[in-house]
């Protein structure tokens, strides 16, 4: 057989026995001569190129470049490949010699004690137990212990080859502590040496670099990269690093095994690459490869090296951010810089601190933006090393889709007395203000549900055929007033009013407001009734802890069974056919209330009294009366709003002022609160008494001092008090000039 590629000038060495395989008997002499065209050498089994006593290599007597290999009294262990080759080349000729020794069919290893086979528990991997044979066609099986198991070649994955040994899937013997080969010759069993089975792992689960990304340094700083390989047990790992400047003087590599918890099914290996003072040439890709022999995994990271610390805003930094109320707003601080800058956000000059509604970090996040978040936000970047600062202003504009104030106040089922004039109002708040508010209407019976129409709690009116209020034929005569603008609760609102000249037919009215970010609508159920009437005593809007009573008056000749109910806290569940006046047809949603019945000559009056009204008493109250003849139920609904108690406050300040004798002083003190506070004036801490020159008007709100005199000088206090306490403001009035002498002569 020939090994290697024939060179142009050299022929392969020629062996005296021109065979690939030679079979000889034990105890005979093996002699092979090799001839060639330059210096030759022999290699033989076991001692692959050493000087063994029994093997003799001699120069031929009959020519140059010729060597004879002689082994007297060969034994089975001499079985193997004999190779003649040119020195320092790959050119060689090989013959495989079997020394048939039936007493020792397996070739023993050099140590003749035991061998070691390394295996992995991989289903797809096979292992070769090197029990080579001195006879080519032996019947060989593999014995594994303990427990004892025998494996026989199956012509597939289990096989024996005299030149190679016994091949078997490694997982089949991974349980075993030792294996050996066994041959049967003439009913006699022969065993190879024992091989200890060592299970080695190969699996690498992952290779992690730390830091994993975004590594930035400036020239002269130390780079430390940790590469951690996590593997299965019984694995050895080789680390290999690739990096830009491989000739680095200050590079240090340290590899070590990391301790893992006992009972862990995993091993950890760490390789640390350290470069003490990086230079610009160290910038680039750093790759760590971990190899277990059967598996290699790698990970890379990019290291950026800056000339010096710096900070700057990125080109994508926004200057104007527009958002709609309720959205999450994210304003990232886009910067370039090393090291990462300290980032501080300010709103209208005030530092922002993170809380549950706002996160002020690399990204300014406002969880649910509201109008009060509108303003100028300044982000200041500070380089922690150089202390260089950069600032940028971002304007946040928060838009508000139209919100209709009455939507939350007025019940969707208010009833209106027949023939009365009524005003319906839509107060719209929107940013930017609505570009239009339109009114629509529809007859109530046209909007009664059909079984096919799905009705939701949020949209209890499934009506689609809205008509413009200009077309009021068949409905109530309508007039839409011009929009007005009002400052309500400190907000600029648009007020649109619709006047119904005479409430003759039950209808639904809808106002719709639209601006650039959305639309809002309010549907008003305008149910006209000739039935009972509700009045509130003593006041339309009581304050909490006050008493209020709802009076339901009905004509006794027409109605009977007056009953007061309160609508449940949930919006009304609307069922098929329940409009108009769904409350009357669904008493399940109502709470019956205790009330007192009174009568006069024509009417029954059912009075429901709320002593010490609370905010929980707010809601829709329903008076139900039954027609004496038809037994049809009539409902009237009235919404009760209970005002919260608010301690007195005084809006605006009293100003200190200087006035000349004889002039007038006019000051006002506007107080708010619930219940409305009483206003009192004091001068130098004594109650101010009205006289010809001191006039108090508008419930003491306005104080006028006519023809001031020197004695009017002093400290004036306006005090507003209610059961919830007092508020006060003070001002000093200075009176200048000399008092005129009164001529009494």
């Amino acid at each position: 057989a020939s090994v290697g590629l024939p060179s142009v000038s050299l022929d392969l060495p020629r062996l005296s026995i021109q065979k690939d395989i030679l079979t000889i008997k034990a105890n005979t002499t093996l002699q092979i001569t090799c001839r060639g065209q330059r210096d030759l050498d022999w290699l033989w089994p076991n001692n692959q190129s050493g000087s063994e006593q029994r093997v003799e290599v001699t120069e031929c007597s009959d020519g140059l470049f010729c060597k004879t290999l002689t082994i007297p009294k060969v034994i089975g262990n001499d079985t193997g490949a004999y190779k003649c080759f040119y020195r320092e080349t790959d050119l060689a000729s090989v013959i495989y010699v079997y020394v048939q020794d039936y007493r020792s069919p397996f070739i023993a290893s050099v140590s003749d004690q035991h061998g070691v086979v390394y295996i992995t528990e991989n289903k797809n991997k096979t292992v070769v137990i090197p029990c080579l044979g001195s006879i080519s066609n032996l019947n060989v099986s593999l014995c594994a212990r303990y427990p004892e198991k025998r494996f026989v070649p199956d012509g597939n994955r289990i096989s024996w080859d005299s030149k190679k040994g016994f091949t078997i899937p490694s997982y089949m013997i991974s349980y075993a502590g030792m294996v050996f080969c066994e041959a049967k010759i003439n009913d006699e069993s022969y065993q190879s040496i024992m091989y200890i089975v060592v299970v080695v792992g190969y699996r690498i689960y992952d290779v992690v670099l730390s830091p994993s990304h975004g590594i930035e340094l400036s020239v002269g700083e130390k780079l430390v990269l940790n590469c951690t390989a996590r593997t299965e047990l019984n694995v050895g790992i080789d680390f290999n690093w690739e990096y830009p400047s491989s000739k680095h003087q200050h590079k240090k590599l340290v590899n070590r095994d990391l301790k893992t918890q006992s009972g862990s099914e995993m091993k950890k290996f760490l390789s640390t690459l350290t470069i003490d003072g990086v230079t610009r040439s160290d910038q680039g890709l750093y790759t760590c490869a971990a190899s277990s022999g059967l598996m290699t995994k790698k990970n890379s990271t990019f290291v950026r090296v800056h000339e010096k610390p710096f900070v700057a805003f990125g080109s994508g930094m926004e200057s104007l951010v527009e958002a709609t109320v309720g959205e999450r707003v994210r304003i990232p601080a886009k910067y370039l810089g090393y090291p990462p800058p300290e980032i501080k956000w300010y709103k209208n000059g005030i530092p922002l601190e993170s809380n549950h509604t706002i996160k002020a970090g690399h990204v300014l996040t406002i969880m649910e933006v509201s109008e009060r978040d509108t303003g100028n936000y300044t982000v200041i970047l500070t380089n922690p090393i150089s202390k260089e600062k950069q600032s940028h202003v971002v304007s946040l504009v928060v838009y508000v889709p139209p919100q209709i104030g009455e939507k939350s106040l007025i019940s969707p089922v208010d009833s209106y007395q027949y023939g009365t004039t009524q005003t319906l109002t839509c107060t719209v708040y929107a940013i930017p203000p609505p570009h239009h508010i339109h009114w629509y209407w529809q007859l109530e019976e046209e909007c009664a549900n059909e079984p096919s129409q799905a009705v939701s709690v949020t949209n209890p009116y499934p009506c689609e055929e809205w008509r413009s209020v200009e077309d009021f034929q068949g409905g109530n005569k309508i007039e839409v007033n011009k929009n007005q603008f009002a400052l309500i609760e400190g907000k600029n609102k648009t007020v649109s009013t619709l006047v119904i000249q005479a409430a003759n037919v039950s209808a639904l009215y809808k106002c719709e407001a639209v601006n650039k970010v959305g639309r809002g609508e309010r549907v008003i159920s305008f149910h006209v009734t000739r039935g009972p009437e509700i009045t509130l005593q003593p006041d339309m809007q009581p304050t909490e802890q006050e008493s209020v009573s709802l009076w339901c008056t009905a004509d006794r000749s027409t109605f009977e069974n007056l009953t007061w109910y309160k609508l449940g806290p949930q919006p009304l569940p609307i069922h098929v056919g329940e409009l108009p006046t769904p409350v009357c047809k669904n008493l399940d949603t109502l709470w019956k209330l205790n009330a007192t019945m009174f009568s006069n000559s024509t009417n029954d009056i059912l009075i429901m009294e709320l002593k010490n009204a609370s905010l929980q008493d707010q809601g829709d109250y329903v008076c139900l009366a039954q027609d004496r003849k038809t037994k049809k139920r009539h409902c009237v609904v009235r919404q009760l709003t209970v005002l919260e108690r608010v301690a007195p406050t005084i809006t605006g300040n009293l100003e200190n002022q200087t006035t000349s004798i004889g002039e007038s002083i006019e000051v006002s003190c506007t107080a708010s609160g619930n219940p409305p506070p009483q206003i009192m004036w004091f001068k130098d801490n004594e109650t101010l008494v009205e006289d010809s020159g001191i006039v108090l008007k508008d419930g003491n709100r306005n104080l006028t001092i006519r023809r001031v005199r020197k004695e009017d000088e002093g400290l004036y206090t306006c005090q507003a008090c209610s059961v919830l306490g007092c508020a006060k403001v003070e001002a000093f009035f200075i009176i200048e000039g000399a008092q005129e002498k009164t001529n009494l002569e």
Epitope: T535, Q537, P538, S547, V548, W551, N600, S601, E609, K611
Partner: nanobody, 124 residues
Framework: QVQLQESGGGSVQAGGSLRLSCVAS????????MGWFRQAPGKEREGVAG????????YYANSVKGRFTISQDNARNTVYLQMNTLKPEDTAIYYC?????????????????WGQGTQVTVSS
């Protein structure tokens, strides 16, 4: 200073009658609405009858309708409650009440002024 002074209370057998009077001082009964309340032992005070400003309309609780009559004498500035066919459940302290012109004082929250009360006891 407004004062309401009740009189006419006392003990009576079931089925008997009593007439309560309420004299108002510092307050015009013709220009305001007036009423009568009662409070039985262990119960809340309840409206019994009312009369509006000018005496054109009278109001009664269901429990006394047809048995009690409210009236007023503007000249004497007095309000009366005529109680007929009295029952043991009518036993209570009866209070005179004054309200604004409207509504009549049929419930406590619209009462502006109260009298001291007079005891009525009906035995079976």
């Amino acid at each position: 200073q407004v004062q309401l002074q009740e009189s006419g209370g006392g003990s009576v057998q079931a089925g008997g009658s009593l007439r309560l009077s309420c004299v108002a001082s510092g307050y015009s009964v013709s220009k305001n609405s007036m009423g009568w309340f009662r409070q039985a032992p262990g119960k809340e005070r309840e409206g019994v009858a009312g009369i509006n400003e000018g005496g054109t309309a009278t109001y009664y609780a269901n429990s006394v309708k047809g048995r009690f009559t409210i009236s007023q004498d503007n000249a004497r500035n007095t309000v009366y409650l005529q109680m007929n066919t009295l029952k043991p459940e009518d036993t209570a302290i009866y209070y005179c009440a004054a309200g604004s012109p409207d509504p009549p004082p049929l419930i406590e929250s619209v009462v502006k002024y109260w009298g001291q009360g007079t005891q009525v006891t009906v035995s079976s």
